[in-house]
């Protein structure tokens, strides 16, 4: 199936021109999504082109300034969060990147009523998280890792807790594994759904081994760098989620929540935490061999001014066959009788689909069944639940929104985006306003993408929220490479891929063929997605076909593909790569003698193992950032996976499916190796040891290490990278410059 | 401090048309919405309408659609609001007034401007 | 639309004295959690004077004895001791729906 034709005939063909590297660079081709932030049922606050922030009310189709470019520009802010009474705005200034999703900030606090900044007992700076009450203007906010509390903003702040302590103990924010591997928030505090409780969880890293890095900078001495990081084995934080009454906190102070026994008796994690009332909580806890998670509902005892979480209110997920969930346990989206709830879960077939659980799991009824699945609950309202799956046309790289009427029985399924923009739109994502009235729909290709805004009642298009007219405009004399999605059928195992195809393609020809991977658990490559990238470049300029396809280990095609991979990384994700490029070869377009692949993480494990494999079928290849060793990287990420680093576990498949353990194998390939040097996530350490390993193994290899960059290699780096990539691939195809 | 200052009173002929002005200063005009409110005698106060003044988007009372359009003037931070085929219970006292949006509430008012509809 | 009614029509009170004005909505005025119901004070020959936004929030510079209270459908002003210029009339405003509607004012009265 062709996703996205160029748009060239002959008469045109002079007009047109290829991309250039300068193009993907430079971000000419990118696109905007629009999602609105909702603030009632039928309004919503957006930056406009001019930096002011405008209220939209859809009912009368008004806007309105609530505030202006200038008082934005006045502390230079950069991001805003309006009070749920609407009083006060939140103004945030002076972002400071930590991790993936921490960062720190100033904070100031605007007056709407009489436009004017709140003076006296200001926040203090920076702050490592900020926001309102769900309900009022009270504020919550994590500094120097303590929690501390405002009835109001002008008022004085109440301190919380007392023990937070830079890399020991973290108040209300997650430390490094939590944000990155469990909770991927900046934050781990939530507020009841009044603003009466605020519930948080407080991590002890004490006795966690700390991975130090050195940090160049400007001085005569680097910095270091140090970060307590459990690795795969090491001893792990210590978690306990506590509930403050934020009416009288002085009162009772924060009580702890219990944790399950079942939970407690070996180490475990806490998974989230989901308000249900004001005065019902519910929390999720998984055991540290992550295939037994564990929801527990708790109350609020008024008498003793604590939380009980009996255990009747424990629902038990347990897989057998691989670990517990997808990329993470999903979360319980509850419905207005406050106590059933809906969660996506492996039915008996080994697809995720929604589940009603009214009383126990056992008894759990199944909302959506199908050889396809469930992939995110949106909005679940009196009568209708919002859900987004890849069911249609059976395409797993699609989404598409559905809504179930659950007011009726039988419940009726409707799809509200198959059919809307059908060529164009396959992928999509939504936003709903309170209680569904209005929704918007972002929908990210594989045409240009295009955001929309809809009746929450008639799912009618109310307006074109953005369209990307100047991209579209841009694009025209632009000579698109083609992009097709199609499957393979090998051995069982249905095999995506998506191929990228030079403009000119020409079937009788032969073209290099480059591999694009990630190939991480439950993770997507084939996606019926628009974007014009680095690989979109090498096609339609450097006249490359590119391949990128889901193997075995991969989401949303069932269980049994998924769950291959567990306890053995390293291993299908490789096969099904070469399987595949097998099978292209085959298609007879394909320049055997110019197949190249190339990763980024995850994806360069897979491609460093890929090009030791010993099947003289890559000529080259690049890493970036990879994994060599499991043991090098996150416990929670790594054992989820492949259990336990030990002898009585699975210490034997951690020893073999290292990158080091195949340096003999590199030496009839071309291997660019890159990283930075202050990764954070996947440390510098694995580069390290594969170029330690292929000096040992007297194996040349080239290497390029960005200083002081983390995982992303971002700025002037990701210019260097890509144009050292280029040039890097371009020598091994033969490829002029 | 702001300050709405409205135009003078106007009589007109049923079957008119009247223009009156409203010209804002101690604020910036682009930042405020503007409504406009009427008076009759002795009677309660009935809205007219809003203007957003960054891209002169309206809003009108369905009562007065086709007879009423409010305009803007930038450079001389002044709005307009016009009603057409005037009869005599348009007789009335015209308000502008400035409408914070995110609490729906006109904060400031003009002086008013008399409209008096008479043959 | 919104019919606002106020009551009583007029209220006779002597400084000093506590004044509650009414005003009822013909449907909810609740948007998600907040009420759009304004207050207003109007002197004779005298433009409207905001005094309470969003049912209970004061405007600008106005005094702590006017307090608004109320959701759905009731509403109320409240003065805790009338002073000699608050005798005047009292008008509520919904801003929840287009068109926004006023009451028909409660004129409060030196006894």
């Known amino acids: 199936i062709v996703l996205r034709p160029s748009r060239v005939h002959n008469s045109e063909e002079n007009t047109m021109r290829a991309l250039t590297l300068k193009d993907i660079l430079n971000g000419t081709f990118s696109y905007k999504t629009f999602f609105p932030n909702w603030i009632s049922g039928q309004e919503y606050l957006h930056q406009s082109a001019d930096n002011n922030i405008v209220l939209y009310n859809i009912e009368t189709g008004q806007s309105y300034t609530i505030l202006s470019n200038r008082t934005m520009k006045s502390v230079n802010a950069s991001n805003y969060g309006l009070s749920p009474d609407r009083q006060f705005v939140y103004l945030e200034s002076d972002y400071s990147k930590l991790w993936r999703y921490s960062y720190t900030a100033t904070y100031y606090i605007y007056d709407l009523s009489n436009g004017e900044f709140v003076r006296g007992n200001e926040l203090p700076r920076p702050i490592q998280y900020l926001c309102w009450s769900p309900v009022g203007s009270k504020l919550a906010y994590v500094y120097q890792n303590n929690i501390y509390l405002k009835q109001r903003p002008g008022d004085p702040p109440f301190q919380i807790t007392f023990n937070g302590r830079e890399n020991k103990i973290f108040n209300g924010i997650p430390d490094w594994v939590y944000e990155e591997e469990m909770l991927a928030t900046k934050y781990a505090l939530w507020w009841s759904p009044n603003g009466k409780f605020l519930a948080y969880a407080e991590f002890n890293d004490t006795d966690i081994p700390v991975i130090a890095y050195s940090y160049y900078g400007d001085e005569q001495y680097p910095r270091t760098i140090n970060i307590p990081y459990p690795k795969a084995g090491a001893k792990n934080p210590v978690v306990r989620i506590f509930i403050i009454d934020t009416t009288y906190p002085a009162y009772v102070g924060p009580q702890e929540v219990p944790v399950p026994a079942m939970i407690a008796s070996s180490d475990y994690y806490f998974s989230w935490l989901t308000w249900v009332t004001d005065e019902r909580v519910c929390l999720q806890w998984l055991k540290r061999v992550q295939n037994v998670s564990v929801l527990s509902i708790c109350d609020f005892r008024e008498d003793w001014q604590t939380w009980d979480c009996p255990k009747t209110q424990e629902h038990i997920e347990e897989s057998r066959t691989g670990w517990a969930g997808g990329f993470f346990v999903s979360t319980p989206v509850f419905s207005y009788d406050a106590i059933s709830y809906y969660k996506i879960f492996s039915d008996k077939d080994g697809y995720k689909h929604i589940h009603y659980i009214k009383d126990t799991v056992e008894n759990a009824i199944q909302i959506t069944s199908g050889k396809w699945e469930a992939i995110n609950i949106f909005r679940v309202t009196q009568d209708s639940l919002f859900y987004s799956s890849n069911e249609f046309e059976e395409y797993p790289g699609r989404r598409n929104i559905y809504r179930i009427s659950i007011g009726s029985y039988p419940p009726s399924k409707k799809c509200v985006t198959c059919h809307l923009r059908k060529e164009r739109c396959q992928y999509y994502t939504a936003s709903f306003s309170d209680y569904a009235k209005y929704y918007a729909l972002v929908c990210y290709g594989p045409g240009i993408p295009i955001s929309t805004l809809h009746d929450g009642r008639t799912d009618q298009e109310i307006k074109i929220l953005e369209e990307n007219k100047e991209l579209e405009n841009a694009l025209k004399n632009i000579q698109l490479p083609k992009e097709e999605i199609k499957k393979l059928e090998v051995d069982e195992i249905t095999l995506w891929y998506k191929m990228i195809l030079p403009p000119q393609f020409d079937r009788s020809k032969k073209y290099p063929l480059l591999i694009q991977v990630y190939g991480g658990p439950c993770s997507q490559s084939v996606r019926s997605v628009f974007a014009v990238n680095w690989i979109s470049y090498l096609a339609s300029k450097e006249g490359m076909v590119i391949a990128l396809v889901d193997g075995r280990g991969t989401a949303f095609q069932g269980d049994k593909l998924l769950y291959a991979v567990y306890r053995k990384l390293g291993v299908y994700e490789v096969e099904d790569q070469i399987t595949a490029v097998r099978k292209f070869i085959e298609m007879g377009f394909i320049d055997e003698k110019r197949i190249a692949i190339w990763g980024w993480s995850y994806g360069g494990y897979v491609s460093s193992l890929a090009l030791a494999s010993g099947t003289g079928l890559f000529k080259c290849g690049i890493a970036v950032a990879p994994v060599s060793s499991w043991e090098y990287y996150a416990s929670v990420y790594t054992e989820r996976f492949m259990g336990l680093p030990t002898k009585d576990d699975n210490l034997e498949h951690y020893k073999n499916s290292t990158v080091m353990a195949r340096a003999e194998y590199f030496r009839n390939v071309d291997y660019l190796l890159i990283h930075g040097t202050a990764d954070d996530n996947v440390h510098f350490q694995n580069s390290a040891q594969i170029a330690k390993a292929l000096v040992n193994a007297q194996v040349d290899f080239q290497a390029m290490w960005y200083s002081d960059q983390n995982h992303g290699l971002s700025g002037l780096s990701t210019n260097h990278l890509y144009t050292h990539m280029t040039h890097f691939l371009k020598q091994c195809f033969s490829l002029s410059d | 401090q702001v300050q709405l200052v409205q135009s003078g009173a106007e009589v007109k002929k049923p079957g008119a048309s009247v223009k009156v002005s409203c010209k804002a200063s101690?604020?910036?005009?682009?930042?405020?919405?503007m409504d406009w409110v009427r008076q009759a005698p002795g009677k309660s106060l009935e809205w007219i309408g809003d203007i957003y003044p960054n891209t002169g988007g309206t809003i009108y009372n369905q009562k007065f659609k086709g007879r009423v359009t409010m305009t803007i003037d930038k450079s001389t931070s002044t709005v307009y609001m016009e009603l057409s085929s005037l009869r005599s219970e348009d007789t009335a006292v015209y308000y502008c007034?400035?409408?914070?949006?995110?609490?729906?509430?006109?904060?400031?008012w003009g002086q008013g401007t008399t409209v008096t509809v008479s043959s | 639309e919104i019919v606002l009614t106020q009551s009583p029509a007029t209220l006779s009170l002597s400084p000093g004295e506590r004044a509650t004005l009414s005003c009822r909505a013909s449907?909810?005025?609740?948007?998600?959690?907040?009420?759009?119901i304004n207050w207003f004070q109007q002197k004779p020959g005298q433009a409207p004077r905001l005094l309470i936004y969003?049912?209970?929030n004061r405007g600008s510079g106005i005094p702590a004895r006017f307090s608004g209270s109320g959701s759905g459908t009731d509403f109320t002003l409240t003065i805790s001791s009338l002073e000699p210029e608050d005798f005047a009339v009292y008008f509520c405003?919904?801003?929840?729906?287009?068109?926004?509607?006023f009451g028909g004012g409660t004129k409060v009265e030196i006894k």
């Open positions: 101690g604020y910036t005009l682009t930042d405020y919405n």
């Open positions: 405003q919904q801003s929840n729906e287009v068109p926004y509607t």
């Open positions: 969003g049912t209970s």
């Open positions: 449907e909810s005025v609740d948007n998600y959690g907040l009420s759009f």
């Open positions: 007034t400035r409408f914070r949006g995110i609490h729906y509430a006109m904060d400031y």
